[in-house]
């Protein structure tokens, strides 16, 4: 799997999980989130050569097409596969509110 | 939806469905498929600017992050959303065999 266990230990130009820390205030302009101040969102990036973690039949076909037709612009792209939620704390007036935000953290990637 | 109805009628630099015909023999080197000779596979391509058809909470966050931090390399990518199968005919010896290949045709795209 193209997850932290594999990607963070190997220097990999191909599609892999990349570390990315997002500071809510600085990077998104969201001042209202009290905790956490930021989080490890991660992201997916890298080339998708022939059969590198292809997600669907179509991405496998496209990957092969691209190998045979290297001048073509049609190629699979490295995107998130497994995502996890993030729990945040913010205030409605003086009252704390805890909310779980779905699909905020990328755990693994795929070529799609 | 970033499908044929929208994308094939509009000149769109952003993430959209693009037409792509794949000839099994010429483009993939697959000589064994009898029918069809090829098919409209289509593919997804184009930029994923701020909030252009963002797929998940993470891609929306990444899109916003990229707007505020334009020098960053972390940005969503244009990939397939809805896929459809393709029915093919091939021969096992003299015996015709019909098979449905899943996820072969891209019908719409998203930024993920």
């Amino acid at each position: 799997a193209l997850d932290a266990a594999y990607c963070f230990r190997n220097v990999q130009d191909n599609c892999c999980l990349r570390p990315l820390y997002i500071d809510f205030k600085r990077d998104l302009g969201w001042k209202w989130i009290h905790e956490p101040k930021g989080y490890n969102a991660n992201f997916c990036a890298g080339a998708c050569p022939y059969l590198w973690s292809s997600d669907t039949q179509h991405s496998r076909v496209l990957s092969l097409y691209n190998t045979i037709n290297p001048e073509a612009s049609a190629s699979p792209c490295c995107v998130s596969q497994d995502l996890e939620p993030l729990t945040i704390l913010y205030y409605i007036g003086k009252t704390p509110k805890i909310e779980q935000l779905s699909n905020m953290i990328v755990k693994s990637c795929k070529c799609s | 939806a970033l499908d044929a109805a929208y994308c094939f009628r509009n000149v769109q630099d952003n993430c959209c469905l693009r037409p792509l015909y794949i000839d099994f023999k010429r483009d993939l080197g697959w000589k064994w498929i009898h029918e069809p000779k090829g098919y409209n596979a289509n593919f997804c391509a184009g930029a994923c600017p701020y909030l252009w058809s963002s797929d998940t909470q993470h891609s929306r966050v990444l899109s916003l992050y990229n707007t505020i931090n334009p020098e960053a390399s972390a940005s969503p990518c244009c990939v397939s959303q809805d896929l459809e199968p393709l029915t093919i005919l091939y021969y096992i010896g003299k015996t015709p065999k019909i098979e449905q290949l899943s996820n072969m045709i891209v019908k719409s795209c998203k930024c993920s």
Partner: antibody, heavy 121, light 111 residues
Framework: QVQLVQSGAEVKKPGASVKVSCKAS????????MNWVRQAPGQGLEWMGQ????????NYNEMFEGRVTMTTDTSTSTAYMELRSLRSDDTAVYYC??????????????WGQGTLVTVSS | DIQMTQSPSSLSASVGDRVTITCRAS??????????MHWYQQKPGKAPKLLIY???NLESGVPSRFSGSGSGTDFTLTISSLQPEDFATYYC?????????FGGGTKVEIK
């Protein structure tokens, strides 16, 4: 410059629903809470609730809970407020207003021009 | 809910007068060193306009004749020298508790 442009006036019958839109421009739509405030003719201001466009998080005034739904379309930077089961005392000017951003509940620095909703049989 | 009581509900004044409007909250709106109290101006047929935020901070573009003060439950909006364009209704607003609430308004009329 920041602008909030609301949809036009509506006349509705009691029991019907109304959906008011608010198109934002001139700022990052997903970085600020959008509030909805109403004002009955000759009366004061009443806060209805709010939504954070990037996440879809909402906080509603309990007085409207179950009757109001706030949504956004981030692709067009538009906020919507739908109020159901309308009564004659819902006749008011409805405003969208951007929170200044320090907290979820906050002061509101930019306001739409208002949408008059008249409920009459 | 926090009740916001403004006084007076209306007042008559002349151009150049010093005008003071008060707002009393039913409980303290102070929290983490901030007073969660704001002031707006509204003219007939127009949307409210933010004047003062967090009790004493002047909103950008608002003339310096407007000022705000107070803490806890008692707050004041002062117009040091009333101008013709200041005749309007003024509202206070708290965001210390859900729901966010406004005062009933103070109408400033020409004497």
């Amino acid at each position: 410059q920041v602008q909030l442009v609301q949809s036009g006036a509506e006349v509705k019958k009691p029991g019907a629903s109304v959906k008011v839109s608010c198109k934002a421009s001139g700022y990052t739509f997903t970085s600020y809470w959008m509030n909805w405030v109403r004002q009955a003719p000759g009366q004061g201001l009443e806060w209805m609730g709010q939504i954070f466009p990037a996440l879809g998080s909402t906080n509603y005034n309990e007085m409207f809970e179950g009757r109001v739904t706030m949504t956004t379309d981030t692709s067009t930077s538009t906020a919507y407020m739908e109020l159901r089961s309308l009564r004659s005392d819902d006749t008011a000017v409805y405003y969208c207003a951007r929170g200044i951003g320090n907290y979820a509940l906050d002061a509101m620095d930019y306001w739409g021009q208002g949408t008059l909703v008249t409920v009459s049989s | 809910d926090i009740q916001m009581t403004q006084s007076p509900s209306s007042l008559s004044a002349s151009v150049g007068d010093r005008v003071t409007i008060t707002c009393r909250a039913s409980e303290s709106v102070d929290w983490y060193g901030n007073s969660f109290m704001h002031w707006y101006q509204q003219k007939p047929g127009k949307a409210p306009k933010l004047l003062i935020y967090y009790a004493s901070n002047l909103e950008s573009g608002v003339p310096s004749r407007f000022s705000g003060s107070g803490s806890g439950t008692d707050f004041t909006l002062t117009i040091s020298s009333l101008q013709p364009e200041d005749f309007a209704t003024y509202y206070c607003q708290q965001n210390a508790e859900d729901p966010l609430t406004f005062g009933g308004g103070t109408k400033v009329e020409i004497k």
